[in-house]
């Protein structure tokens, strides 16, 4: 004979476990239904009645099957330097990522908590390492024979033009000036740009580290004060 299908709530077999999308309620000592994403447990189960679920309120969500008494609050609205790449719904949290020209200086489990603008290298300095979604531009002084005359987060140092006769020698922030005879150059004229990072959806899926240090840090330093707590707001 086929085994009878048990309807929640039911007492599990000794040593047995509850089925998928069920949980064991310690108080009732029964297997009870979980609530689906977008809902939470309004009334917990008893020996005779199953879990009563209710929809999440505005600006709150649950992403998984659950039996939480309250839905989770969606994170703060995205700031002006961020783009909302995923809206707050009853089933998912809001995800904010940095707008073009900015990078994520404080990551969280999904998206970014704090964006900062990519550093611009001033004249006499060029980009040594381009910015990415999660790293700032690194600038370096232009080496002898090279220059940068721009304030830019993408321009690298480029070689001085080579003159037959130099009118004004070049320096770190200015190209050489040649007399009327045509100059030669080892590179094409004009600023050389490094590609800007393309802002894609969040790739930060690592678990949130201990709160004593800012999330996403991996270098070894004495642990310092933690960033301020994240606010949450209603829409």
């Amino acid at each position: 004979l086929p085994a009878q299908v048990a309807f929640t709530p039911y007492a599990p077999e000794p040593g047995g476990t509850c089925r998928l999308r069920e949980y064991y309620d310690q108080t009732a000592q029964m297997c009870c239904s979980k609530c689906p994403p977008g809902q939470h447990a309004k009334v917990f189960c008893t020996k005779t009645s199953d879990t009563v679920c209710d929809s999440c309120e505005d600006s709150t969500y649950t992403q998984l099957w659950n039996w939480v008494p309250e839905c989770l609050s969606c994170g703060s609205r995205c700031s002006s330097d961020q783009v909302e790449t995923q809206a707050c719904t009853r089933e998912q949290n809001r995800i904010c990522t940095c707008r073009p020209g900015w990078y994520c200086a404080l990551t969280k489990q999904e998206g970014c908590r704090l964006c900062a603008p990519l550093r611009k290298c001033r004249p006499g300095f060029g980009v040594a390492r381009p910015g990415t979604e999660t790293s700032d531009v690194v600038c370096k002084p232009c080496a002898p024979g090279t220059f940068s005359n721009t304030t830019s987060s993408t321009d690298i140092c480029r070689p001085h033009q080579i003159c037959n006769v130099v009118a004004v020698p070049g320096n770190a922030s200015m190209d050489a000036v040649c007399t009327s005879t045509s100059p030669t150059r080892s590179m094409a004229p004009g600023p050389v740009h490094l590609p800007q990072p393309v802002s894609t959806r969040s790739q930060h899926t690592q678990p949130t580290p201990a709160p004593s240090t800012a999330p996403g840090t991996s270098f070894l330093l004495p642990v310092g004060p933690s960033p301020p707590a994240e606010g949450s707001t209603g829409d």
Epitope: Y103, A105, L106, T107, L114, R119, R122, F125, T134, S135, D136, V138, C139, T213, A214, P215, G216, T217, S218, F219, L221, P222, G224, P225, P227
Partner: nanobody, 118 residues
Framework: HVQLVESGGGSVQAGGSLRLSCAAS????????MSWVRQAPGKGLEWVSA???????NYSDSVKGRFTISKDNAKNTLYLQMNSLKPEDTAMYYC????????????WGQGTQVTVSS
């Protein structure tokens, strides 16, 4: 023991000025970029300004021309001179340090409250 301690916050009328200070200890000040970050009530963190090891600086559009960031390496202190304050500048202001080459803010102060009334 790393410490960042902000001071200089307070209440001011719109159009007024304040100067925030951040005293740093327990790490090599010159090896870090220093920033000011603020958080308005019920809002997320907002980057305000940064100063780099070569003393070049950067500002958010909302404060450019009104705020000036500076530092004194000898005193291990970061400053933010805030002029022409507006009610929308009301926030908790934090100083934060980012280790050069690591890209993530590592150390934070406890914050100083700035309230601008109209």
């Amino acid at each position: 023991h790393v410490q960042l301690v902000e001071s200089g916050g307070g209440s001011v009328q719109a159009g007024g000025s304040l100067r925030l200070s951040c005293a740093a200890s327990g790490f090599t000040f010159s090896s870090y970029y220093m920033s000011w970050v603020r958080q308005a009530p019920g809002k997320g963190l907002e980057w305000v300004s940064a100063i780099y090891s070569d003393d070049s600086d950067n500002y958010s559009d909302s404060v450019k021309g009104r705020f000036t960031i500076s530092k004194d390496n000898a005193k291990n202190t970061l400053y933010l001179q805030m002029n022409s304050l507006k009610p929308e500048d009301t926030a908790m202001y934090y100083c934060a340090a980012i280790r050069i080459g690591t890209d993530q803010y590592k150390f934070w102060g406890q914050g100083t409250q700035v309230t601008v009334s109209s």
